[in-house]
């Protein structure tokens, strides 16, 4: 059931996000999410998992884009790309906006 | 969009209890801790407690521990509060809030007789 | 008696700069992070600043936050009439095992 907490050793992660006490969080793997809102510069965010590791196999979108670890701090330095938009087709001396 | 409804409040004598609902929508629940904090009228913010994501740990303010119960049910999106032997000093706005960002519209308790 | 000490008052004129400052200990803004929350009247709080210094999406950059030690300000610049309200830091305490909050700033744009 992937909505059951994971019970394995936990390991200590950089939390950098709204949800945050501290610098680091413990967890059963360490995430980076670079989110994308509806009109906005995206936000990368740097925390713990310990729910929905099926979130972890996602491909990147241009929305968002979840990438995790399972080693000490090894979500500190991870960068994360979105997917680039696929422009629709464009029609000869039509202007792009 | 996240969104969190509170309901619940309402006129109690001392002594009463209510049970405070949070209906939490537009992200994915279970994946959040969720806190209450309160707002006595014409003062600051007070927080009350909070569950983590499974509900297996939660954490209270001293004065609220043995009184009040949080709880949620991640198959309903929902976070509640019990509130045991209330007191005329916990008259206030309780709000329900996904740590650490968003806060819904808060629901008014009153204890008085 | 809150557990982050702020000033009650703050007041500044149109296109001012103005700093809240939060004053705490070593088990709360000393060893954690600091957010800022900015309350409108009658409306709830809204999250301004997270991590010490960042602001959310939709925040705009005339708000900054800083820490130093167990002390944070909240920075306010080009101060507007619409920035009047109440201001709250807050962290998580790990000696009572909770989150505590500033007693509140009330900001008038004067």
């Known amino acids: 059931d992937p909505v059951k907490p994971s019970r394995g050793p936990l390991v200590t992660c950089t939390c950098e996000s709204p949800h945050c006490k501290g610098p680091t969080c413990r967890g059963a793997w360490c995430t980076v999410v670079l989110v994308r809102e509806e009109g906005r510069h995206p936000q990368e965010h740097r925390g713990c998992g310990n729910l929905h590791r099926e979130l972890c196999r996602g491909r990147p979108t241009e929305f968002v884009n979840h990438y995790c670890c399972d080693s000490h701090l090894c979500n500190h330095n991870v960068s994360l790309v979105l997917e680039a938009t696929q422009p629709p087709s464009e029609q000869p001396g039509t202007d792009g906006q | 969009e996240v969104q969190l409804l509170e309901s619940g409040g309402g006129l109690v004598q001392p002594g009463g209890s209510l049970r405070l609902s949070c209906a939490a929508s537009?992200?994915?629940?279970?994946?959040?801790?969720m806190s209450w904090v309160r707002q006595a009228p014409g003062k600051g913010l007070e927080w009350v407690a909070n569950?983590?994501?499974?509900?297996?740990?939660?954490n209270y303010v001293d004065s609220m521990r043995g009184r009040f119960t949080i709880s949620r049910d991640n198959s309903k999106n929902t976070l509640y509060l019990q509130m045991n032997s209330l007191r005329a000093e916990d008259t206030a706005v309780y709000y329900c809030?996904?740590?650490?960002?968003?806060w819904g519209q808060g629901t008014l308790v009153t204890v008085s007789s | 008696q809150s557990v982050l000490a702020q000033p009650p008052s703050a007041s500044g004129t149109p296109g001012q700069r103005v700093t809240i400052s939060c004053s705490g200990s070593?088990?709360?803004?000393?060893?954690?992070?600091v957010y800022w929350y900015q309350q409108l009247p009658g409306t709830a709080p809204k999250l301004l600043i997270y991590?010490?210094?960042k602001r959310p999406s939709g925040v705009p950059d005339r708000f900054s936050g800083s820490k130093s030690g167990t002390s944070a300000s909240l920075a306010i610049s080009g101060l507007r009439s619409e920035d009047e309200a109440d201001y709250y830091c807050?962290?998580?305490?790990?000696?009572?095992?909770?989150?505590?909050f500033g007693g509140g700033t009330k900001l008038t744009v004067l």
């Open positions: 809030a996904r740590e650490f960002d968003y």
């Open positions: 537009g992200f994915t629940f279970s994946s959040y801790a």
């Open positions: 569950i983590n994501q499974d509900g297996s740990e939660k």
């Open positions: 070593s088990s709360n803004i000393g060893s954690n992070y």
């Open positions: 991590g010490n210094n």
């Open positions: 807050a962290a998580w305490d790990d000696s009572l095992n909770g989150r505590v």
